[in-house]
Interface confidence: low
Amino acid sequence: SEGRKTWRRRGQQPPPPPRTEAAPAAGQPVESFPLDFTAVEGNMDSFMAQVKSLAQSLYPCSAQQLNEDLRLHLLLNTSVTCNDGSPAGYYLKESRGSRRWLLFLEGGWYCFNRENCDSRYDTMRRLMSSRDWPRTRTGTGILSSQPEENPYWWNANMVFIPYCSSDVWSGASSKSEKNEYAFMGALIIQEVVRELLGRGLSGAKVLLLAGSSAGGTGVLLNVDRVAEQLEKLGYPAIQVRGLADSGWFLDNKQYRHTDCVDTITCAPTEAIRRGIRYWNGVVPERCRRQFQEGEEWNCFFGYKVYPTLRCPVFVVQWLFDEAQLTVDNVHLTGQPVQEGLRLYIQNLGRELRHTLKDVPASFAPACLSHEIIIRSHWTDVQVKGTSLPRALHCWDRSLHDSHKASKTPLKGCPVHLVDSCPWPHCNPSCPTVRDQFTGQEMNVAQFLMHMGFDMQTVAQPQGLEPSELLGMLSNGS
């Protein structure tokens, strides 16, 4: 039964749940359909179109699918809390036919001292308290149960874990007389997993821990711990994987150095250094052992923690990430960009690309943006002709045992997708940029000129005349 895996269901009961092992991977795209992939390898697009059409025609049959909402469940263990002591929780939409579980960690920066946490509590209370959380949330992007919006995992059990610990999902300290705030991000994840085991997660085949921004970094910090937790609880059958979106930051030199005054201007290394102490932050054990005491902040940076991780992780990162630029004190205000800044931005893209060199599963478009996976149009961006849902599908397949020990990429199914063009929005599928003052959409050529990129400079490395390049960019090619 090794070589060819079909999706035949045997016996009457829903097939396998956990037994005792965590292996990288058996991701068949739509696990409920009796389909055999082997005959369609050559024409995947047509095949996926058929699956989509079949899914859409079956869609009305499933009453549970008609309600798109994820429902709020506050943790039963109320000692695991948000910053202000209110119970943490999660939003869940079950998909009873599926043994895939997607747990999404929300993002939203962080605070690292009493002063900026107080300020955050005043202005962004939802990120520090569950008191005003809505009863339901709509799943979008990778959390959508609509096959057309989420061709990757529409049929999965969807879990959205709101970020209310302000600690990049790393904290392990409770509120006390001494501590005005609780920072329990790492504990919240563990408790959500524990509670979900009683809601069907115990029967999972794959748990994908995903997250965006601070949630993406949270994935890198927690994915191995979740795998270990499940093994210890007797569910090593569940394959734990990570999907880190826009959480792969660089501890690079800021464009302009500023003192560590607030969350946004403080250099990330200093913010995290202070944060870890304030949050009683925990990092993956194998990474921690690589650094001296007091140097655990290193493990918040993707390129340092990734090589120590055991679970498979797919990294999604814009080469010109807006949060990265913000902490580097680059603020693109619409004024023409000076050459020094242009070179800084281009170098950032180059450095980021370099850190992804040895990350086999990665998707890094050369765009100026932030976060992607829970955007409704997350399917639109392509790198080298491959969309992100498609790349994730290929990742699932590459992890699946049917490809035996072969480490060579699957033909026509790439998982390492990093743009090589050197400036923001040189990829024509990048999300549309808007002028932040007028709100007007800009095409790539307008955007680059708006940013002060000299068309001659941009065109030359491509072996093009500026006029040719402008024509190409204006046509979106």
């Epitope: 829903p14 749940p17 037994r19 115990s202 059958a237 992890l399």
Partner: antibody, heavy 119, light 111 residues
Framework: EVQLVESGGGLVQPGGSLRLSCAAS????????MNWVRQAPGKGLEWVSY????????YYADSVKGRFTISRDNAKNSLYLQMNSLRDEDTAVYYC????????????WGAGTTVTVSS | DIVMTQSPLSLPVTPGEPASISCRAS??????????MHWYLQKPGQSPQLLIY???NLESGVPDRFSGSGSGTDFTLKISRVEAEDVGVYYC?????????FGAGTKLELK
């Protein structure tokens, strides 16, 4: 063809040590949890030990805890069982088995290697 | 530990006739809609082979005269028509918790 081949069994005195090996082929060894299961002469099957695919987790039956150590080398597609302080009651055929992703059952078994503990 | 009790311990059957083996767990081995009970056959002089996993799922390559049923603590393996090649010892095994344990075995022989 998916195959597990055990080796390293033999006659050993009580208190002695032995190291069993299991060579895997025909599947992605590094993706599966592996187990040792034994069968004493004329008796039933007894689960001995488990190791996860990544080696993060190991489990042992109470009867061997502290004496046996399971390990694996994914680069060599090999599973091992180091048996120390052997006792008469450890005499058995030792099977290496692959644990399926889906539910804690053993879907591939080796032919077994015989360990005899006797003075 | 979860104790698995199999019955009968010996089962003489006429070829072509049905056979049924029972396995009882000392506590429930079912959870979240799944039953962590599996069945193996060990033919004379061979290593065990998987027949049924998760109570009712037929392993690839196993003849469909074999079937499994049950949930909670009581499980049954049925052979609709016994053939000569079915001779051997049948074991049930649970994977609900550690340690994983097997039943004592049921020896199926031909009359």
């Amino acid at each position: 063809e998916v195959q597990l081949v055990e080796s390293g069994g033999g006659l050993v005195q009580p208190g002695g040590s032995l190291r069993l090996s299991c060579a895997a082929s025909g599947f992605t060894f590094s993706s599966y949890g592996m187990n040792w299961v034994r069968q004493a002469p004329g008796k039933g099957l007894e689960w001995v030990s488990y190791i996860s695919s990544s080696t993060v987790t190991t489990y042992y039956a109470d009867s061997v805890k502290g004496r046996f150590t399971i390990s694996r080398d994914n680069a060599k597609n090999s599973l091992y069982l180091q048996m120390n302080s052997l006792r008469d009651e450890d005499t058995a055929v030792y099977y290496c088995s692959r644990q399926n992703w889906d539910g804690g059952y053993f879907d591939v078994w080796g032919a077994g290697t015989t360990v005899t503990v006797s003075s | 530990d979860i104790v698995m009790t199999q019955s009968p311990l010996s089962l003489p059957v006429t070829p072509g006739e049905p056979a049924s083996i029972s396995c009882r767990a000392s506590k429930s081995v079912s959870s979240s809609g799944y039953s962590y009970m599996h069945w193996y056959l060990q033919k004379p002089g061979q290593s065990p082979q998987l027949l049924i996993y998760l109570a009712s799922n037929l392993e690839s390559g196993v003849p469909d005269r074999f079937s499994g049923s049950g949930s909670g603590t009581d499980f049954t393996l049925k052979i609709s028509r016994v053939e000569a090649e079915d001779v051997g010892v049948y074991y049930c095994q649970h994977s609900r918790a550690l340690p994983l344990t097997f039943g004592a075995g049921t020896k199926l022989e031909l009359k």
